[in-house]
């Protein structure tokens, strides 16, 4: 019961996290105009990963997409890439985890397969969350660097009566959404990995194997199933032949703890 709850909660938390990562990636408020030195402007600028916007006090908002790919800063491209990788991994993780949920029965899928899928989705969520956190943090670092550079420029070369105030940008709402969403996805992934341990049946060495003969002799390797850490082939953990006979731990699965090396 606790395993199902942990897995279910991990799935829900990851789902919320990935929705947040998608929202943050699409949001225009990655950086917003700093109004500390200039609160009386009638024109407010903010920028996202895909376009920059200007909102006037009248309510009129105009947004322009970044229609160049090569002309954009490498850091912005890197942030875009990290966020997209995070979304893709998260989406695949969600898809995998749906089939891995203990409360959902799909054919005769065994718990060991579900454990594998749960672990895989958990790892995907963790990497997805880390990608989002990394992307947002890289952007935030870029903002901080530019902020202090523009501040230095503001207070130098201000000769004469005319002032040219350089627009400074500070953290936008999308950064906080991204950080929280990345964190949630990460937590969800960890929960899935924890749930995986409870899902996998213990390796049991049976002295006797009961089976129904299918008309010819069948060779068995004792030990039944052992949950592997992935979908790849692992001869140590597989039955040699799937005949008409079934080992004891195929007939009934027992939720138990399992150690991973």
């Amino acid at each position: 019961m606790a395993v199902t709850a942990c897995q279910g909660l991990g799935f829900v938390v990851s789902l919320i996290g990935i929705a947040g990562i998608i929202a943050a990636t699409c949001m225009d408020q990655w950086s917003t105009q700093d109004l500390y030195n200039n609160p009386v402007t009638a024109v407010f600028n903010y920028q996202g990963l895909w376009r920059s916007c200007v909102r006037e006090s009248s309510g009129f908002t105009e947004c322009r997409g970044y229609f160049t790919l090569l002309g954009l800063p490498a850091m912005l491209q890197a942030v875009r890439a990290l966020m997209i990788v995070g979304i893709v991994l998260g989406a695949i993780g969600l898809l995998v985890s749906i089939f891995a949920l203990k409360c959902i029965r799909i054919g005769s899928m065994e718990d060991s397969a579900k454990a594998n899928m749960t672990l895989t989705s958990g790892i995907m969520f963790i990497v997805s969350g880390l990608c989002a956190i990394a992307g947002v943090s890289v952007f935030a670092n870029m903002l901080v660097t530019n902020f202090w550079m523009s501040t230095a420029n503001m207070y130098t070369g201000m000769g004469g009566m005319v002032q040219t105030v350089q627009t400074r940008y500070t953290f936008g709402a999308a950064l906080f959404v991204g950080w929280v969403a990345g964190g949630l996805t990460l937590i969800g992934g960890v929960m899935m990995c924890i749930a995986c341990r409870g899902l996998a049946p213990e390796e049991t060495n049976y002295k006797a194997v009961s089976y129904h003969a299918s008309g010819h002799s069948v060779a068995y390797k004792p030990g039944g199933f052992k949950a592997s850490t992935g979908f790849g082939s692992n001869t140590k953990n597989k039955k040699i032949y799937d005949g008409g006979a079934r080992t004891e731990d195929e007939v009934q699965s027992y939720p138990s703890k399992h150690d991973y090396v």
């Epitope: 009386v40 402007t41 006090s57 009129f60 040219t164």
Partner: antibody
Framework: QVQLKESGPGLVAPSQSLSITCTVS????????VYWVRQPPGKGLEWLGV???????NYNSALMSRLSINKDNSKSQVFLKMNSLQTDDTAMYYC????????????WGQGTSVTVSS | DIVMTQSPSSLSVSAGEKVTMSCRSS????????????LAWYQQKPGQPPKLLIY???TRESGVPDRFTGSGSGTDFTLTIGSVQAEDLAVYYC?????????FGSGTKLEIK
């Protein structure tokens, strides 16, 4: 068509308050902002303040303490109230509509003359 | 507050001549976000309310004759009347619409000889 019409008291005693109403037609106050501008006799234009479509306001910092702008969207009316009037507040008071993009005043009322005198 | 300085304060020209008047702001009115200048020009004829001629420093308001041209960027702006007509007798004001309060220039009075 778009029209703005100011109506005021004409004569106000010093230290008294001034109330002017701007009645608009041809557009909705929920879509456009309305500015107030005044012009003393023989002088230039002075921006007083604005009430935006959403109801937020901005005022001339020099007059902020004694100025307030409100509106009634259903009646299509904008109200200017100024306290503690002095003789140098004698002017023609105009209301004007914000054009929506790039913040300028595209339609103006004919103005109402206000004289501050005892 | 932003100070708007207009020059000359008045000028007298003959009909058909080209007129140029300037407006300077104490702070740049160019917004980096959209590369637009938040400056407007108004014409006020005697006994009338002002009329919008130019917004965004260079965009002519609908119905305004094409002899009126706005130019400039940042802190220096110009209003040019290509061929002055008798009906252009008026005071011309520039206005900052980037920073509150939306200050006006002192005006340039155009007289026809």
């Amino acid at each position: 068509q778009v029209q703005l019409k100011e109506s005021g008291p004409g004569l106000v005693a010093p230290s008294q308050s001034l109330s002017i109403t701007c009645t608009v037609s041809g557009f909705s106050l929920t879509s456009y902002g309305v500015y107030w501008v005044r012009q003393p006799p023989g002088k230039g234009l002075e921006w007083l303040g604005v009430i935006w479509a959403g109801g937020s306001t901005n005022y001339n910092s020099a007059l902020m303490s004694r100025l307030s702008i409100n509106k009634d969207n259903s009646k299509s009316q904008v109200f200017l109230k100024m306290n503690s009037l002095q003789t140098d507040d004698t002017a023609m008071y105009y209301c004007a509509r914000d054009r929506g993009r790039l913040l300028s005043m595209d339609y103006w009322g004919q103005g109402t003359s206000v004289t501050v005198s005892s | 507050d932003i100070v708007m300085t207009q020059s000359p304060s008045s000028l007298s020209v003959s009909a058909g001549e080209k007129v140029t008047m300037s407006c300077r702001s104490s702070q740049s009115l160019l917004n980096s976000g959209n590369q637009k200048n938040y400056l407007a020009w108004y014409q006020q004829k005697p006994g009338q309310p002002p009329k919008l001629l130019i917004y965004g420093a260079s965009t002519r308001e609908s119905g305004v004759p094409d002899r009126f041209t706005g130019s400039g960027s940042g802190t220096d702006f110009t209003l040019t009347i290509g061929s002055v007509q008798a009906e252009d007798l008026a005071v011309y004001y520039c206005q900052n619409v980037h920073f509150f309060p939306f200050t006006f220039g002192s005006g340039t009075k155009l007289e026809i000889k």
